[in-house]
Amino acid sequence: CKAMHVAQPAVVLASSRGIASFVCEYASPGKATEVRVTVLRQADSQVTEVCAATYMMGNELTFLDDSICTGTSSGNQVNLTIQGLRAMDTGLYICKVELMYPPPYYLGIGNGTQIYVIDPEPCPDSDF
């Protein structure tokens, strides 16, 4: 396993609809054709997998149908979107990139993006 640099933004604020997007960029050390991207969430020293996708270079990023993540790839950067977020989902979201094929295998883990989610205030009843 060889190490690889990964960069991602330090902080992202989710929209009022609970959607957060960020870029994950990696320093590809060679001609990888198969790449796996995983988003991990770290909160209270617990790390859980949020979503993962494997893609072939030049093809679209495809997550499982029930995934809360969507994304697109362009060269050695991936644009990730996480949906359905609520205030309790606030935490550090880490981008993990693996170059699966051809060998050698490379692994890169970003420093994480702190995603802040604020639940919207319910609309007050209207008198009109």
Partner: nanobody, 126 residues
Framework: EVQLVESGGGLVQPGGSLRLSCAAS????????VGWFRQAPGKEREELAC????????DYPGSVKGRFTISRDNSKNTVYLQMNSLRAEDTAVYYC???????????????????WGQGTQVTVSS
């Protein structure tokens, strides 16, 4: 859209040095990571070096590490490849390529670059 033009190639004796330039027009190069590659007749394109947008991140394959150095001058919209201790096997056409990125990293994979120069010939011979 950015366009790239390489220069600085030519004939050099074994053990000599050359500095290649990759000049950009049509856009500011500081928005792009840049890579240098080469292709010899009958061989696959080979990665040589890359440099991130700010110049703080560079990467080289083991085959040229220590002999080749990549640098950039964003004020001149130019990226350079300094090549020392040249050998006959360094004879090839040298290309630079650019990729628009968000952060400071770069890639050594030719698959990641979407804009390429026309190339400059380097011949190492006595």
């Amino acid at each position: 859209e950015v366009q790239l033009v390489e220069s600085g190639g030519g004939l050099v004796q074994p053990g000599g040095s050359l500095r290649l330039s990759c000049a950009a027009s049509g856009d500011t190069l500081e928005s792009f990571a840049v890579g240098w590659f080469r292709q010899a007749p009958g061989k696959e394109r080979e990665e040589l070096a890359c440099i991130g947008r700010t110049g703080e991140f560079t990467d080289y394959p083991g085959s040229v590490k220590g002999r080749f150095t990549i640098s950039r001058d964003n004020s001149k919209n130019t990226v350079y490849l300094q090549m020392n201790s040249l050998r006959a096997e360094d004879t090839a056409v040298y290309y630079c390529a650019a990729e628009r990125l968000v952060f400071h990293l770069c890639s050594l994979s030719e698959y990641d670059y979407d804009t390429w120069g026309q190339g400059t010939q380097v011949t190492v011979s006595s």
